[in-house]
């Protein structure tokens, strides 16, 4: 069966939303009117892992392109990245690990808590304009919230 | 008054190793992304590394990646730069700087010179 | 990498003048821009950042203006402390970049 996905947008809970910084990095900046334009539709594909009732592992693929974010050891360091793939071959159920995400939603916020490196969540910094990147701490003054807007097809 | 205060320039063989600190004050250290930018003599400025408050996020110039560390003591209001196999290219003042807003530099310290020669 | 080109790289000017010195980005960065004033023997100054936004106690004889890829700092009234060294710098995407500088010298 074809893998499900939905498309979504993506604020964290400073209400900042994700656009495209360069070709393979995104930043998280306050948007209004016009320019809520630049943020990045994600494609949301509910892959195969290991899933609870507030877990559900998810592969964020941006929308129209063949760009999913990973997450891969660069200087010995968990780090996030936007990842080229073979557009005929993904998405797919089977994702590898570094693409996979534990969707986890607690009190109507999202965290994204990478497959490959427990404990390392899709964070974004207090600060305007600055990247997403992947984050090993919760709690502190980096942001690991999120909420989902559904973009319609 | 902000005020950042740079030390561990000097002279260095070609594929030795330097470790730069910032000493910052003035204001809340912690809450602050802080630039390192470098600027060779008589030449332009050169963004070289950025680290986001809790270190979490690092970035660095690809004339400098896998060469060059960027981290901080906020206990100690410091930000280090720790190079490592220096080139004679790395010839500059170092410079600090505080993050304002969107990704200026809004303060600067007053630099410190590395000269990597033999 | 985005690519930030200044010019002129040098300009002969009096004091009083009115002068204009232009930033062109390689690709589209929104309002992301800033502008600072360089001293021989000192660390660079926050003129103005966001593209138009003048940083607290810089005069406002300095304005920048622009759009997308171009963009230009005006000095109107030029004195004789604004003889420098001026830089663009995109803070669109990492990494960094700053335009090669334009130098304001005494005509």
């Known amino acids: 069966a074809p893998v499900r996905s939905l498309n979504c947008t993506l604020r964290d809970s400073q209400q900042k939303s994700l656009v495209m910084s360069g070709p393979y990095e995104l930043k998280a900046l306050h948007l209004q009117g016009q320019d809520m334009e630049q943020q990045v539709v994600f494609s949301m594909s509910f892959v195969q892992g290991e899933e609870s009732n507030d877990k559900i592992p998810v592969a964020l693929g941006l929308k129209e392109k063949n760009l999913y974010l990973s997450c891969v050891l660069k200087d010995d360091k968990p780090t996030l990245q936007l990842e080229s793939v073979d557009p005929k071959n993904y998405p797919k159920k089977k994702m590898e690990k570094r693409f996979v995400f534990n969707k986890i939603e607690i009190n109507n916020k999202l965290e994204f808590e990478s497959a490959q490196f427990p404990n390392w969540y899709i964070s974004t910094s207090q600060a305007e304009n600055m990247p997403v990147f992947l984050g090993g701490t919760k709690g502190g003054q980096d942001i690991t919230d999120f909420t989902m807007q559904f973009v319609s097809s | 008054e902000v005020q950042l205060l740079e030390s561990g320039g000097g002279l260095v063989q070609p594929g030795g190793s330097l470790r730069l600190s910032c000493a910052a004050s003035g204001f809340t250290f912690s809450k602050y992304f802080m630039f390192w930018v470098r600027q060779a003599p008589g030449k332009g400025l050169e963004w070289v590394s950025v680290i986001s408050p809790s270190g979490g996020m690092t970035r660095y110039a690809d004339s400098v990646k896998g060469r060059f560390t960027i981290s901080r003591d906020n206990s100690k209001n410091t930000l280090y730069l720790q190079m490592n196999s220096l080139r004679a290219e790395d010839t500059a003042v170092y410079y600090c700087?505080?993050?304002?807003?969107?990704?200026?530099?809004?303060?600067w310290g007053q630099g410190t010179l590395v000269t990597v020669s033999s | 990498d985005i690519q930030m080109t200044q010019s002129p790289s040098s300009v002969s000017a009096s004091v009083g003048d009115r002068l204009t010195i232009i930033c062109r980005a390689s690709?589209?960065?929104?309002?992301?821009l800033a502008w600072y004033q360089q001293t021989p023997g000192n660390a660079p100054k926050l003129l103005i950042h966001s593209l138009t936004s003048l940083q607290s106690g810089v005069p406002s004889r300095f304005s920048g203006s622009g759009s997308g890829t171009d963009f230009t700092l005006t000095i109107n009234s030029l004195q004789p402390e604004d003889f420098a060294t001026y830089y663009c710098?995109?803070?669109?995407?990492?990494?960094?970049?700053f335009g090669g500088g334009t130098k304001v010298e005494i005509k």
């Open positions: 710098q995109q803070a669109d995407s990492f990494p960094l970049t």
């Open positions: 700087a505080r993050v304002g807003y969107g990704g200026n530099s809004d303060y």
């Open positions: 690709q589209d960065i929104n309002r992301w």
